[in-house]
Interface confidence: low
């Protein structure tokens, strides 16, 4: 095992969750761990530094960001209430609080609202057949190529993840009930000739 | 000082072929991906491919299965050889150091036309 | 291929004025971003790299600034040999892209 820095012809680092290419002076490099950021550049003879996130700023993986993200709380107006706080390595975990229930966009948790009698279950999603009272609710299956990943009553079936429109690749198929999951690709020397 | 030399330009003609070189000194050529761009009359900048230290290739969509980049560590030369010519690919081409393109040579002229 | 918009494309000013020149990366690139400076007939010389750090040997009236998306070449006062073509160039990833460059003139 090669430590960094170090210069490898394919520009595919030994250990590339914990590597990284450094394209300025051509070495691989450390990443920084979980809840630490790059505090000094790697170069040809000294390896990556790195340093604890801030009060209040967070890393979540292995990563080679010139800052931390800042912890947001969990919008109590929004319906949510915190299970996990934010530390520097993971950030806050989120929840409706109880009697609510997701409402979804883009495949994110956007608010919480108050559930109704009728809940969908994941796979599901409601079919209204009064528009205008929104009380007659019948759950109906997620087409092919969609999920739906809540028991909510105003649950909508999303479109799965293409992952390469984010420049990813699939780890894993979407079903019914759970998103594709993307991946970073190779790193781009796993792609030279 | 780095410097980074090309050459093997040239009027060709549709169809046609040329082998350009880029001539390195003032640093480690061995340790060094090598990159190539190029620029068409009037437009701007084009990334052609990289190389990496031991021969490896990267090349833009436009050139695949045309262009082939080579280098001999031992003659500190960088190589593109360029085939099936069109003339969309009239530029100045030039090699840089690195494949962040640090160091860039002066250009040598690829004039493609019948 | 992760795209680069430059802007503006042209810009008129005189020697002694502050010169603002922007790049836009259509997807996060850190601050893996430089600025080049090509006067006709000549190779581009490379002047700012990893966004904000100035290559040895050029006037401190250029700065770079900016991460993730957003970047901007700042000429704090223009020289009669500053007026030339800027382009910027990303190597988040492996392709290299420019933007479409920017030709400073005399006003």
């Known amino acids: 095992q090669l430590v960094p820095p170090y210069r490898i012809e394919n520009q595919t680092c030994w250990d590339q969750d914990k590597e990284y290419y450094e394209p300025m002076h051509d070495v691989c490099c450390s990443r920084c761990p979980p809840g630490e950021f790059v505090f000094a550049v790697c170069s040809r003879s000294q390896d990556t530094v790195c340093k604890t996130c801030p009060h209040n700023s967070y890393n979540e993986h292995w990563n080679h960001l010139s800052t931390c993200q800042l912890c947001r709380p969990c919008d109590i107006v929004l319906g949510f209430e915190e299970v996990a706080p934010c530390t520097s390595d993971r950030k806050a975990e989120c929840r409706c609080q109880p009697g609510m229930s997701c409402v979804y966009l883009d495949n994110e948790c956007v608010h919480c609202e108050e559930e109704r009698l009728v809940l969908c279950q994941p796979g599901t999603e409601a079919e209204v057949t009064d528009e205008i009272m929104d009380t007659d609710v019948n759950c109906v299956p997620c087409k092919p190529g969609h999920f739906q990943n809540t028991s909510s009553p105003r649950a909508r079936c999303q479109p799965h993840t293409r992952c390469e429109i984010q420049g990813l690749v699939e780890a894993a198929p979407g079903t019914s009930y759970s998103d594709t999951i993307c991946k970073n690709p190779p790193e781009p020397g796993a792609m030279l000739l | 000082e780095v410097q980074l030399l090309e050459s093997g330009g040239g009027l060709v003609q549709p169809g046609g072929s040329l082998r350009l070189s880029c001539a390195a000194s003032?640093?480690?050529?061995?340790?060094?991906?090598m990159t190539w761009v190029r620029q068409a009359p009037g437009k701007g900048l084009e990334w052609i491919g990289v190389?990496?230290?031991?021969?490896?290739?990267y090349y833009t969509d436009s050139v695949k299965g045309r262009f082939t980049m080579s280098r001999d560590n031992s003659k500190n030369t960088l190589y593109l050889q360029v085939n099936s010519l069109r003339a969309e690919d009239t530029a100045v081409y030039y090699c840089?150091?690195?494949?962040?393109?640090?160091?860039w040579g002066q250009g040598t002229t690829v004039t493609v036309s019948s | 291929d992760i795209q680069m918009t430059q802007s503006p494309s042209s810009l008129s000013a005189s020697v002694g004025d502050r010169v603002t020149i922007t790049c836009q990366a259509s997807?996060?690139?850190?601050?893996?971003l430089s600025w080049y400076q090509q006067k006709p007939g000549k190779a581009p010389k490379r002047l700012i790299f990893?966004?904000?750090s100035l290559e040895s040997g050029v006037p401190s009236r250029f700065s770079g600034s900016g991460s993730g998306t957003d970047f901007t070449l700042t000429i704090s006062s223009l020289q009669p040999e500053d007026f030339a073509t800027y382009y910027c160039?990303?190597?988040?990833?492996?392709?290299?892209?420019f933007g479409g460059g920017t030709k400073l003139e005399i006003k």
């Open positions: 840089a150091k690195a494949s962040t393109a640090d160091v």
């Open positions: 003032g640093f480690t050529f061995s340790y060094y991906a």
């Open positions: 190389i990496n230290s031991g021969g490896g290739t």
């Open positions: 997807q996060g690139i850190s601050n893996y």
């Open positions: 990893a966004a904000s």
């Open positions: 160039q990303q190597y988040n990833s492996y392709s290299l892209t």
